[in-house]
Interface confidence: low
């Protein structure tokens, strides 16, 4: 079928443009070109006929067109004009026509944009500036860049007009960048030259440095303003309120005592019309001062308060130093220092924290040290303790007890018998007890400072005879070969012998075993399952004795190496197997079996009816402590022959 | 060795609720303050809140105040950020850091759990 190809289909004005023709037919006799979609006469372009070679310029010709013998078409200087289509009129040599319609588009070649502004200066935080991308062109594309990047997403951009006008509301510094709008039609792109947003901002409020406020006699002050601005800040000083200079920069050389006061910055913007100050004010020492500490608790309690001590003064360009008695910090994550070593805080400070604490301000040549510090942590009252340590006593003695407890500042003490205030002493004396004197004695210590209260009680026995004593455990079920059990034999009695019996000998020697706090304790170290016996403890003295009940040790142990029974290993088929496992263990093992390593049963026998050389394999007897957390288990073969067959000879022999 | 680990971040809807926790090693969370800090992009690094468990001392930012909630457990050595009533804004990577009493000064920190508030 008759084609036509335009090559290309977007056209830029002044250029050219081919109408190609496709699959023309054989035997023409000639051929035509009209604008348009149809055959008109009055729109003829160019004839031509194939005999004669001869081309003939139509009402349509404007001089810019040459038809080729392959019936295309070049269009040269193409005008906006030339859009649209273009028909070509084929009459064969039997005089039949055929007729093809192709069509091509011309576009502008755009020209360079630019960038116009309704605002060359906005404000920040008050002006919008709308951007407009010149000249306005017809059918095409406005595309912007904001720093060569495509445009962010923002409440505050806002594109219209055909995206040919660009706004930006309530600008801010963020916003100075550049600017570039491209425009885009089918045959050409043109990209503006940059425009830099000139955002008006500030001043800021100025900052003042070096930080610093403190100085020495005789050094320089040299203080710089800085303060965010556009355009740049005036800056102006002024030292206790009066005028001083128009400088970025305050130099004041050999300083004394008399420069010590207030020292205001002004930045001002002569474009936004405002105004920002600050104000530092600086001390000028006569001499290097001697450093002294201060705290922000003299009277921290423990566990509860935090400290900060602060060396004094601050100065400029000075190292401070600390020590904690007469040596360097040590590292703690309860001690900080802050960034400029000035202060040392104290986290949740302890009784231990008392110090000496001292800072030191490195100069020159020396090092001033500050007088120590020491910190009056406050504590307690601990749990007191009462001494001695008896509860039993002999009827006619005198009773002296004694109360103790750790506390800043000391304890308050009081004693209480059977819940009824006695004395607010230390020392409870009582002379020549009777059997009257038994009771409960309470020590109660306070601290005022904290307002906390710690109390002991103590229950004290007078008898002229003994008590039945008792056996107290720190284990009750050891493990074998790995705990140590300690008895102790109770009462703690005054003037008392204390004596002790195993399965009612006296006590075997062995390293194994050991006496202590006065025979009152009886130690058995790494137990053994022999260690299992009947303990009994005895109290004696001038007057009576008496005999504990048996305490009987408990030692855990194995489980050991189990024994299958029986021990036959071989067996004739029919049979019945019926195999025991036993283990040596305290509590009694748990039992498993497994057969060519398939678990079987829990059970400490395993029962199989009528055996055939299938069950032919080996056998495991697992065991498992659960107290001791220990394992153990054996492993037997068993070998299963056919009837009438004895072990190891082949059958018909 | 000090170890800070924080856990409980996620995606949660504007007026929605998480609780942070952070759980602390190497130390007593007695002896110390604890804080929660947290930074998001083209924001300034923010201390949220800070609590010192051995007197129960709190302090908050004036952007969270009445919304969370901080808190310690000293038996599990770890503490806690309640935050209520989430805006976009809280939007952040959380980190739990040990904070000075004094200067709110902060160190040791956590590896961070990360916080978004959309709809």
């Known amino acids: 079928k008759l084609t036509i190809e335009s090559t290309p289909f977007n056209v830029a004005e002044g250029k050219e443009v081919l109408l190609l023709v496709h699959n023309l037919p054989q035997h023409l006799f000639g051929y035509s070109w009209y604008k348009g979609e149809r055959v008109d006469g009055n729109r003829q372009i160019i004839g031509y006929v194939i005999g004669t070679q001869q081309a003939t310029p139509g009402p349509a010709y404007s001089g810019r067109e040459i038809i080729y013998p392959n019936a295309s078409l070049l269009i040269q200087n193409i005008i906006q004009n030339d859009t649209g289509f273009y028909t070509l009129h084929v009459i064969k040599s039997d005089l039949v026509n055929e007729e093809a319609t192709g069509q091509f588009r011309v576009y502008p070649e755009l020209p360079k944009p630019s960038i116009s502004s309704n605002n060359s200066k906005p404000v920040e935080d008050k002006d919008a500036v709308a951007f407009t991308c010149e000249p306005e062109t017809q059918d095409a594309t406005y595309l912007w860049w904001v720093n060569n990047q495509s445009l962010p997403v923002s409440p505050r951009l806002q594109l219209s007009n055909g995206n040919r006008t660009l706004t930006l509301f309530n600008v801010t510094r963020n916003d100075t960048a550049s600017y570039k709008c491209e425009t885009q039609n089918p045959v050409s792109a043109r990209r503006s030259d940059s425009v830099i947003l000139n955002v008006l901002y500030g001043p800021d409020a100025p900052t003042i440095s070096p930080l610093n406020t403190s100085y020495r006699s005789g050094e320089n002050l040299n203080l710089s303003c800085h303060a965010a601005s556009n355009p740049p800040a005036q800056y102006s000083w002024f030292v206790n309120g009066t005028f001083q200079q128009s400088t970025q920069e305050l130099f004041i050389p050999n300083i004394t005592v008399n420069n010590s006061g207030s020292y205001t910055c002004q930045a001002h913007n002569s474009d936004t019309g405002l105004n920002r100050t600050t104000v530092t004010t600086i001390t000028v020492y006569a001499e290097p001062p001697k450093p002294f500490i201060t705290s922000n608790n003299s009277n921290p309690v423990e566990d509860e308060d935090a400290v900060a001590l602060t060396c004094e003064p601050e100065i400029q360009n000075t190292t401070y130093l600390w020590w904690v008695n007469n040596q360097s910090l040590p590292v703690s994550p309860r001690l900080q220092l802050s960034n400029d070593n000035r202060t040392l805080t104290l986290l949740s400070v302890t009784r231990n924290d008392v110090g000496p604490y001292e800072c030191g301000i490195q100069n020159e040549l020396s090092v001033d040290h500050s007088d120590p510090v020491i910190l009056n942590v406050l504590y307690g009252p601990d749990d007191p303790t009462i001494s001695p340590s008896y509860t039993y006593y002999r009827p006619g003695v005198n009773l002296s007890l004694s109360c103790h407890a750790a506390s800043n500042p000391p304890a308050q003490y009081s004693w209480l018998i059977d819940g009824n205030i006695q004395q607010h002493t230390q020392e409870l004396f009582i002379s020549n007890i009777t059997e009257k004197n038994s009771g409960l004695y309470t020590c109660q210590a306070n601290n005022s400072a904290s307002g906390h209260s710690r109390t002991t009680v103590k229950t004290i026995t007078v008898s002229a005879e003994l008590p039945k004593p008792s056996i107290s455990s720190n284990n009750s079920k050891p493990v074998e070969d790995k705990d140590a059990v300690a008895f102790t034999c109770e009462p703690e009695a005054q003037n008392t012998t204390y004596l002790w019996w195993v399965n009612g000998q006296s006590l075997p020697v062995s390293p194994r075993l050991q006496l202590s706090n006065g025979n009152r304790t009886l130690t058995l170290f790494n137990v053994t399952r022999n260690d299992a016996r009947a303990y009994v403890c005895g109290i004696q003295n001038s007057v009576s004795a008496n005999r504990s009940d048996p305490v009987t040790l408990d030692v855990l142990y194995g489980p050991d190496t189990p024994i299958i029974s029986p021990p036959d290993s071989s067996y004739l088929s029919g049979a019945n197997l019926n195999l025991s496992c036993h283990s040596a263990s305290n509590p009694s093992p748990q039992y498993s079996w497994r057969i060519n390593g398939i678990p079987q049963q829990h059970t400490q026998v395993l029962f199989i009816a009528k055996i055939t050389p299938n069950n032919n394999g080996t056998y495991a007897c697992f065991v498992s402590n659960l107290a001791t957390g220990r394992n153990n288990s054996i492993v037997k073969s068993i070998t299963v022959s056919a009837s009438g067959t004895s072990p190891g000879l082949s059958a018909g022999a | 060795e000090v170890q800070l680990v924080e856990s409980g971040g996620g995606l949660v809807q504007p007026g929605g609720s998480l609780r942070l926790s952070c759980a602390a090693s190497?130390?007593?969370?007695?002896?110390?303050?604890i804080g929660w800090v947290r930074r998001a992009p083209g924001k300034e690094e923010e201390l949220v809140a800070d609590i010192c468990p051995s007197y129960g001392g709190t302090r908050y930012a004036d952007s969270v105040k009445g919304r969370f909630t901080i808190s310690a457990d000293t038996s599990k050595n770890t503490a806690y950020l309640q935050m209520n009533s989430l805006r976009a804004e809280d939007t952040a990577v959380y980190y739990c850091a040990i904070v000075s009493k004094i200067d709110q000064y902060y160190n040791y920190w956590g590896q961070g759990t990360t916080v978004t508030v959309s709809s």
């Open positions: 190497g130390f007593n969370i007695k002896d110390t303050c």
